[in-house]
Interface confidence: low
């Protein structure tokens, strides 16, 4: 016997309290699937949520965060405050990058300079606390009276805080 | 079903540590947000502390900002706070929770009490 | 962060209506829950997103959430309700509050 209910369309639901007709949805609520037996509460964007897409009846509300938060979360579930490139948001607010570490973006953690000599190679461009470092060729490619930039000394930069 | 088991409380002299931990199951314990709420004997709820999934970014009451560290093992499911310099009026009995706010699905661990005397 | 004030206490006579409020500066562009908390146990979530309501909570449980007063409304209270109730206002952000608590007296 087939389910009466699996005729009702996404933005409808089977009402049971009408005999199984297929009731729209009522306001503030949606059904994305066909069959449904009730329809889900669309989802409020408030707070430093804002709305990046209308409820309907068929598709649930999302939303993204107001300008200074950026989504953290399957969905956006939270929001997270911005920091500026050069620093990292920790348990006492956005801090600046320490020496050695950079980060190019308004979000995550501060990350090590690229080591070059690792890789053979040399530091062309030195790293600051919004960019990694630029690794050039390594010096026995380097032609006779070329050189490279030389890497900064193990100081603390001005304007580093320790962590 | 989600089932969320703290441990560690006890008797602890001012200025000691001790170390909490919640053990989780029912769940996949990486995708969530991981919250730790206490409450002092006849008072209300106050909230302490949250830790991202990966562990990357922690968050803190200003009440416990500098002594406390909330961390988590997602290897394990467990979830930990590692209390130091403990004071009498952080007596309370602390809860796990997963905390969802907006959506259907905040439970709480039963509580493990910690109290601080000397 | 936002105050919540609730009232200590709330009593109310078996099957009427108990309202619980929770005001904080403009907590109505903010989402709040409601946890129901029963001497000895955790918290139990009876409200969350204002006015929804968990899977298991009884239909007597509402809330609704504007200006600055959230609301928890529990019509035909029963002897099984009293409690400690607790509002929690979130605005999206990472760190939670919590309200001072109210004690439902069924008298």
């Known amino acids: 016997l087939q389910d009466p209910c699996s005729k009702c369309p996404a933005g409808t639901f089977c009402d049971n309290n009408r005999n199984q007709i297929c009731s729209p949805c009522p306001p503030n609520s949606f059904s994305s699937t066909s069959g449904q037996k009730a329809c889900d509460i669309c989802r409020q964007c408030k707070g430093v949520f804002r709305t990046r897409k209308e409820c309907s009846s068929t598709s649930n509300a999302e939303c993204d965060c107001t300008p200074g938060f950026h989504c953290l979360g399957a969905g956006c579930s939270m929001c997270e405050q911005d920091c500026k490139q050069g620093q990292e948001l920790t348990k006492k607010g956005c801090k600046d990058c320490c020496f050695g570490t950079f980060n190019d973006q308004k979000r995550g953690i501060c990350r090590p300079w690229t080591n070059c000599s690792l890789d053979g190679k040399s530091v062309l461009v030195n790293g600051t606390k919004e960019r990694d470092v630029v690794c050039g060729p390594s010096p026995a490619d380097l032609s006779p009276g070329a050189s490279s930039v030389t890497p900064p000394a193990p100081a603390r930069e001005p304007g580093h805080s320790p962590q | 079903q989600v089932q969320l088991v703290e441990s560690g409380g006890g008797l602890v002299q001012p200025g000691g540590s001790l170390r909490l931990s919640c053990a989780a199951s029912g769940f996949t314990f990486s995708d969530y947000y991981m919250h730790w709420v206490r409450q002092a004997p006849g008072k209300g709820l106050e909230w302490v502390s949250v830790i991202s999934g990966s562990g990357s970014n922690t968050y803190y009451a200003d009440s416990v900002k500098g002594r406390f560290t909330i961390s988590r093992d997602n290897s394990k499911n467990t979830l930990y706070l590692q209390m130091n310099s403990l004071r009498a009026e952080d007596t309370a009995v602390y809860y796990c929770?997963?905390?969802?706010?907006?959506?259907?699905?905040?439970?709480w661990g039963q509580g493990t009490l910690v109290t601080v005397s000397s | 962060d936002i105050e919540l004030t609730q009232p200590p206490s709330v009593s109310v006579a078996p099957g009427q209506t108990a309202r619980i409020s929770c005001s904080g500066d403009n907590i109505g562009s903010k989402y709040v829950s409601w946890y129901q908390q029963k001497p000895g146990q955790a918290p139990v979530l009876v409200i969350y997103s204002d006015s929804e309501r968990p899977s298991g909570i009884p239909e007597r449980f509402s809330g609704s959430n504007s200006g600055n007063t959230a609301t928890l409304t529990i019509s035909g209270t029963q002897a099984e309700d009293e409690a400690d109730y607790y509002c929690q206002s979130w605005d999206g952000s990472i760190s939670r509050v919590f309200g001072g608590g109210t004690k439902l007296t069924v008298l």
């Open positions: 929770a997963r905390l969802y706010a907006q959506f259907e699905g905040d439970f």
